[in-house]
């Protein structure tokens, strides 16, 4: 058993049929010595008396809010949560496996630039009685500070018969130099509590590996005289690291109709303009990627050909 | 310890081409190592990230763009002295700071070159003959060093009398290639910045 936060404790259980469970001793936080009784949750049934209560925790029915009282007055609470371990593996029931970029990916993180600011998100099908707490650091043995905000519900989607909820959190490394060469990864730890179930999820990454620029901005078209070609130009996104001559981007320019199966014109360039062939009912799209370290491409920025 | 903006005309910067070739060569070599050594811990997640130039050079700080010198997190630089007679810029206006930056890059390359050559000598003794260093990568390191054209004492190639541990050597190769790729990215950014200034 260990303390998650004040008056909240996590009991780690090997989860298999007829498992013996864990013996837990609760102590009432009071100077009083006599006349103390214990109850669980909303029940008025007295579980025991005395300053300490010893319980055998085997299943979720044994978890919950234990309260010690004296003469009708509440003295203190202890909330017990369960963390299940099945076949040596901690349970991952609360969050959905996003399977990208690989299996068992529960947390996904992205950064728009090298400033040390990043966003992580996760998915769940659970809608109520759900809380998250996020901590982060650079390195684990001698951790350097990363400050994370509160996790918030950022999107709701319908997937078949199920509703899916996306939560996200923003974090900022306390003293980040955009030009630095990372040797210690960022560690992100998410504590998830659903009713009386506790789970924790972690992700470890270098900012350079989670870079995904915003799409290029200000796409403009200029038809070329006596030609089917148009010159398309754009600018670096405002959120990208500066100076741009140091943090350079490369671009992919594509002309395509509505269907992915349609024919297309595609060209890659390090410049902020390109010449392509425009077709009726097609659109020109441009996306960006770090020129020197190939992490993710940005989403497309698009304009119609006409 | 930063780069001033008064740098040479675009076109006057032969190092940019060499640094692009360097990044390409080390990226290809790293990809080859990851494929060939698929049963070794050779991915970014599996290896320890070591920097053989740590406390010996300070390329990131010495080559910091002017715009980032306002960022205090970028300025915890280690003082290191460098040789200052680089010719990469082909310009009389080469500033002291820029020479410091370029000589730091040169020292990085020299240290990696020695490490890679020592390692290759060991890998050539491996009866499995599983992986060797790409001669193109070694040649590209040499070309960029020549373009930087700094005079410095030659570092003797380390020779080891004991029987090499090929497993350890291959893991060390992965560590070295990952670190060198990150440094090659920095070098490319620096050259691009200097070329544009």
């Amino acid at each position: 058993i260990w303390e998650l936060k004040k008056d909240v404790y996590v009991v780690e259980l090997d989860w298999y049929p007829d498992a013996p469970g864990e013996m837990v001793v609760l102590t009432c936080d009071t100077p009083e010595e006599d006349g103390i009784t214990w109850t669980l949750d909303q029940s008025s049934e007295v579980l025991g008396s005395g300053k300490t209560l010893t319980i055998q925790v085997k299943e979720f029915g044994d978890a919950g809010q234990y309260t010690c009282h004296k003469g009708g007055e509440v003295l203190s609470h202890s909330l017990l949560l369960l963390h299940k371990k099945e076949d040596g593996i901690w349970s991952t029931d609360i969050l959905k496996d996003q399977k990208e970029p690989k299996n068992k990916t529960f947390l996904r993180c992205e950064a728009k630039n090298y400033s040390g600011r990043f966003t992580c998100w996760w998915l769940t099908t659970i809608s109520t009685d759900l809380t998250f707490s996020v901590k982060s650091s650079r390195g684990s043995s001698d951790p350097q500070g990363v400050t994370c905000g509160a996790a918030t519900l950022s999107a709701e989607r319908v997937r078949g018969d199920n509703k899916e909820y996306e939560y996200s959190v923003e974090c900022q490394e306390d003293s980040a130099c955009p030009a630095a060469e990372e040797s210690l990864p960022i560690e992100v730890m998410v504590d998830a509590v659903h009713k009386l179930k506790y789970e924790n999820y972690t992700s470890s990454f270098f900012i350079r590996d989670i870079i995904k620029p915003d799409p290029p901005k200000n796409l403009q078209l200029k038809p070329l005289k006596n030609s089917r070609q148009v010159e398309v130009s754009w600018e670096y996104p405002d959120t990208w690291s500066t100076p741009h001559s140091y943090f350079s981007l490369t671009f992919c320019v594509q002309v395509q109709g509505k269907s992915k199966r349609e024919k297309k014109d595609r060209v890659f360039t390090d410049k902020t303009s390109a010449t392509v062939i425009c077709r009726k009912n097609a659109s020109i799209s441009v996306r960006a990627q770090d020129r020197y370290y190939s992490s993710s491409w940005s989403e497309w920025a698009s304009v119609p050909c006409s | 310890r930063n780069l001033p903006v008064a740098t040479p005309d675009p076109g006057m910067f032969p190092c940019l081409h060499h640094s692009q070739n360097l990044l390409r060569a080390v990226s290809n070599m790293l990809q080859k190592a990851r494929q060939t050594l698929e049963f070794y811990p050779c991915t970014s997640e599996e290896i320890d990230h070591e920097d053989i130039t740590k406390d010996k050079t300070s390329t990131v700080e010495a080559c910091l763009p002017l715009e980032l010198t306002k960022n205090e997190s970028c300025l915890n630089s280690r003082e290191t002295s460098f040789i200052t007679n680089g010719s990469c810029l082909a310009s009389r206006k080469t500033s002291f700071m820029m020479a410091l930056c370029l000589s730091s890059i040169y020292e990085d390359l020299k240290m990696y070159q020695v490490e890679f050559k020592t390692m290759n000598a060991k890998l050539l003794m491996d009866p499995k003959r599983q992986i060797f260093l790409d001669q193109n990568m070694l040649a590209v390191i040499d070309e960029l060093m020549q373009a930087l054209n700094f005079n410095s004492e030659t570092v003797p190639q380390k020779s080891s009398l004991e029987e090499p541990d090929f497993y350890k050597t291959k893991i060390k190769l992965c560590i070295l290639l990952h670190a060198f790729r990150i440094r090659a990215v920095t070098i490319d950014r620096v050259m691009s910045y200097l070329n544009a200034s």
Partner: antibody, heavy 118, light 107 residues
């Protein structure tokens, strides 16, 4: 399976024209750009131009502008390349090639030898 | 027009050995470069698109690298069926242009 089958070899007199055909099978004809590339004996490849069979849009290499015409007949899934004012240096194997991507070629025809000789 | 220069023009190789062909562009073309194989009397065949993207059905011994002005096609271990002429082609701008070709022959 996608195939491009070209018409047979031709012998032409200088100053005349030649029209080479390229019939496509497999896949929808108008879903691909169609290009013409030539190869003179012992020489490399030389791009001549492309057509979008869907709308008849064409683009030609400046070297051939005014002398080459590329057309397409959707009903027969056939593209044509006509080269006029032939000279001896136009002796070459003419190949059609296609792709959904405009700027490179994933399927090629077998080639048609055009000999220009007096 | 962008001029593409291949080297060497002829490359004698022992079967089973690796082979590398270089292609240089007269100006920067990013990764807009493609490689083809041509055998006498046969259709040309696309091997690599956009400098390094492998093509379905092409053996994994063919790989491409490069960007900007310098590109390489590598055949890791030459098989008897690989003896042919190889061309690079730029797609950065029209007119599309090819290298002169490299003939890989049996040593």
């Amino acid at each position: 399976q996608v195939q491009l089958v070209q018409s047979g070899a031709e012998v032409k007199k200088p100053g005349s024209s030649v029209k080479v055909s390229c019939k496509a099978s497999g896949g929808t004809f108008s879903d691909y750009y169609l290009h013409w590339v030539r190869q003179a004996p012992g020489q490399g490849l030389e791009w001549m131009g492309w057509i979008d069979p869907e709308n008849g849009d064409t683009e030609y290499a400046p070297k051939f502008q005014g002398r080459v015409t590329i057309t397409a007949d959707e009903s027969t899934s056939t593209a044509y390349m006509e080269l006029s004012s032939l000279r001896s240096e136009d002796t070459a194997v003419y190949m059609c090639a296609r792709n959904k991507e405009l700027r490179y070629f994933d399927v090629w025809g077998q080639g048609t030898l055009v000999t220009v000789s007096s | 027009d962008i001029v593409m220069t291949q080297s060497p023009l002829s490359l004698p190789v022992t079967p089973g050995e690796p082979a590398s062909i270089s292609c240089r562009a007269s100006q920067s073309i990013s990764i807009n470069l493609h490689w083809y194989q041509q055998k006498p009397g046969q259709q040309a065949r696309l091997l690599i698109a956009f400098a390094s993207q492998s093509i379905s059905g092409v053996p994994s011994r063919f790989s491409g690298s490069g960007s900007g002005t310098d590109f390489t096609l590598t055949i890791s271990s030459l098989q008897p069926e690989d003896f042919a002429t190889y061309y690079c082609q730029q797609s950065n701008s029209f007119p599309l242009t090819f290298g002169q070709g490299t003939k890989v022959e049996i040593k």
